[in-house]
Interface confidence: low
């Protein structure tokens, strides 16, 4: 349906303060770099404008897209220049080769400090002072930090951050009431980015196509009682909810993502008898709610797939009369089935039967050729579960920190080209898989370790893609999505690789370290770990071990001592020497 | 999005007729083969009937043999099930459904022989 002001009928839909939320979170994931003033300003000027189109469509530059209208104002910005460099040429495109510019300049990784936290009655007297300044900063911040932080999303976000100062900044000790949530909400978000940036990835890099693939087997899973037509429509809908936040249009993406909970609301019947507790929430609140909803108990009733997938003399003409949805149909049956598989494992499993259809539809009999196919899934089901198997026992042996350094010793040895920080972070996130599904029931392990790695991973594969250095870590990223996670698992030792020369001054420390919270002293000893492999690629795990023992009995004795600064300074090089001669 | 609704249903006496229609959208009609399959109360999915995406190619269950007829109608994406001489053990809801799969991807329409 067609407006005669985009612009105007958006701020209908959503309201004043969804609006600028959302305008704020847009221009803020394009310019990264501007400060929080200038955003407000560009802000507030086009929520003027859209006030003077709701009175008037007609009135002048109305009738512009959205992407006109942003990407006007946004160019309008004094120092584009000086702080974006290349950026600034966008300006000089027309719609649409200009929003294509601005998104392909997004930067995953962009050169901003850490957030610090300010002490709590800070915090609350801004957030006293002014309401309005404090969440549209929180808006601004997180935007900046994750430009394809989903948008409608991250205002529910903004209603949580708001919730949590409003009742604890009344309580009788604001910090132990506000830090934990503080703390729940930075973490959320940080998953929250993550899984987002897979869907964008997927989008962008494999097309819609892949991700409809993907929505198909989660969605199957979720709502197992619904028909298949009932699926492809919430599989369409989704795509184009995401399609739109991915491409930078948030305003069109909160619009249709409100259509999607109230269309799903009133249709609960044919979805899932789980969506009841979350159709009486509001809009924000609901759309998070059914995003999150648990899988729906699978029908009683369902028949063996074997009939009409393996069984049937129709298989080839049913697939080559409609490859696509005979396919969708093949995964939507299986997915449903199975809610304890992975979602990347449903689609290797799709991808495995379109393979030997192919094969077989072309041969002299093609019934003989495929009446196998079921089998040849064994190894590619086993390969997950092992794996999940495996890692499960080893964390449960060592602790988070220490599978956290087996992981980082593994990677660090299959891609040592990779930037340390990259390395350490991206073995981390790895690493908290152990905490995050180990101790789930075994039917909910494989789904919760495997798609939450193939997120990880994907944050390995954007920050490679901005500064490629491997192409190993090249070639799992973009031949295939559903076998990024394998493609990783099965790299072993880069016998190639020219170990880095050592450098002193990369393992000498000082008495800040410890100052340091408990977190920041594992990153330093993480770092100091992916060091000492790309150094030594072939050291065994026992050397390693010997080597990191010493470290922290280093930093303790350093930081028990009187003068910490004359301790590292003496023990220090005597830890590097003895290192060198244990790696020797 | 794919949609399948189904038409035609009713209540009708032994050796009468009916004809169901089911009406499809959001892929391309004329490029797919098409089945009837029907689901008796308490039992599972039973295929009765399938179409080429031409229409020159059907097959029948044997129960429906001599009795039914599946044809379509491309322009208008329409699929039909002529059915004469009804018995009480074709009471079932029928729904149409893509290629020969029995999986059921609609509502469907309530077909009911009884006197």
């Known amino acids: 349906d067609t407006h005669k002001s985009e612009v105007a009928h958006r701020f209908k839909d959503l309201g004043e303060e969804h609006f600028k939320g959302l305008v704020l979170v847009a221009f803020s994931q394009y310019l990264q770099q501007c400060p929080f003033e200038e955003h407000v300003k560009l802000v507030n000027e086009v929520t003027e404008f859209a006030k003077t189109c709701v009175a008037d469509e007609s009135a002048e530059n109305c009738d512009k897209s959205l992407h006109t209208l942003f990407g006007d104002k946004l160019c309008t910005v004094a120092t584009l220049r000086e702080t974006y460099g290349e950026m600034a040429d966008c300006c000089a495109k027309q719609e649409p080769e200009r929003n294509e510019c601005f998104l392909q300049h997004k930067d995953d990784n962009p050169n901003l400090p850490p957030l610090v936290r300010p002490e709590v009655d800070v915090m609350c007297t801004a957030f006293h002072d002014n309401e309005a300044t404090f969440l549209k900063k929180y808006l601004y911040e997180v935007a900046r930090r994750h430009p394809y932080f989903y948008a409608p999303e991250l205002l529910f976000f903004a209603a949580r951050y708001k919730a949590a100062f409003a009742e604890c900044c009344q309580a009788a000790d604001k910090a132990a009431c506000l830090l934990p949530k503080l703390d729940e909400l930075r973490d959320e978000g940080k998953a929250s980015s993550a899984k987002q940036r897979l869907k964008c990835a997927s989008l962008q890099k494999f097309g819609d196509r892949a991700f409809k693939a993907w929505a198909v087997a989660r969605l199957s899973q979720k709502f197992p009682k619904a028909e298949f037509a009932e699926v492809s429509k919430l599989v369409t809908d989704l795509t184009k909810v995401h399609t739109e936040c991915c491409h930078g249009d948030l305003l069109e993406c909160a619009d249709d993502r409100a259509d999607l909970a109230k269309y799903m609301c009133e249709n609960q019947d044919s979805i899932s008898s789980k969506l009841k507790e979350c159709c009486d929430k509001p809009l924000l609140e609901k759309s998070h709610c059914l995003a999150e909803v648990e899988n729906d108990e699978m029908p009683a009733d369902l028949p063996s797939l074997a009939a009409d997938y393996v069984e049937s003399k129709d298989v080839c003409k049913n697939y080559a009369e409609a490859k696509d949805v005979f396919l969708g149909m093949f995964l939507y049956e299986y997915a449903r089935r199975h809610p304890d598989y992975s979602v990347m494992l449903l689609l290797r499993l799709a991808k495995a039967y379109e393979a030997t259809l192919e094969k077989c539809c072309a041969a002299a009999d093609p019934h003989e050729c495929y009446a196998k196919v079921f089998d040849e899934f064994q190894p590619l089901v086993e390969e997950p579960q092992n794996l999940v198997k495996q890692n499960c026992e080893l964390f449960e042996q060592l602790g988070e920190y220490k599978f956290q350094n087996a992981l980082l010793v593994r990677y660090t040895k299959k891609v040592p080209q990779v930037s340390t920080p990259t390395l350490v972070e991206v073995s981390r996130n790895l690493g908290k898989v152990g905490a995050k599904c180990c101790k789930l029931p075994e039917a909910k392990r494989m789904p919760c370790a495997e798609d939450y790695l193939s997120v990880v991973l994907n944050r390995l594969c954007v920050l490679h893609e901005k500064t490629p250095v491997s192409e190993k870590v090249t070639k799992c990223c973009t031949e295939s999505l559903v076998n990024r996670r394998p493609c990783f698992s099965a790299l072993e030792l880069d016998e190639a690789y020219v170990p880095k020369a050592f450098n002193a001054e990369t393992f000498t420390f000082h008495a800040d370290m410890c100052t340091l919270s408990e977190k920041e002293k594992q990153v330093k000893k993480q770092t100091a770990l992916v060091e000492l492999v790309k150094h030594k690629p072939k050291a065994t795990k026992e050397q390693l071990k010997g080597v990191m023992d010493n470290f922290a009995a280093f930093v303790e004795k350093c930081c028990k001592a009187d003068d910490k600064e004359a301790c590292f300074a003496e023990e220090g090089p005597k830890f590097v020497a003895a290192s060198q001669a244990a790696l020797a | 999005q794919v949609q399948l609704v189904e038409s035609g249903g009713g209540l009708v006496q032994p050796g009468g007729s009916l004809r169901l229609s089911c009406a499809a959208s959001?892929?391309?009609?004329?490029?797919?083969?098409m089945s009837w399959v029907r689901q008796a109360p308490g039992k599972g999915p039973e295929w009765v009937s399938a179409?080429?995406?031409?229409?020159?190619?059907?097959r029948y269950a044997e129960s429906v043999k001599g009795r039914f007829t599946i044809s379509r109608d491309n322009a208008k994406k329409t699929l039909y099930l002529q059915m004469n001489s009804l018995k009480p053990e074709d009471t079932a809801v029928y729904y149409c459904?893509?290629?020969?799969?029995?999986?059921?991807g609609s509502q469907g329409t309530q077909v009911t022989v009884s006197s």
């Open positions: 959001g892929f391309t009609f004329g490029r797919f083969g």
């Open positions: 179409i080429d995406s031409g229409g020159a190619d059907t």
């Open positions: 459904t893509i290629g020969r799969s029995t999986s059921r």
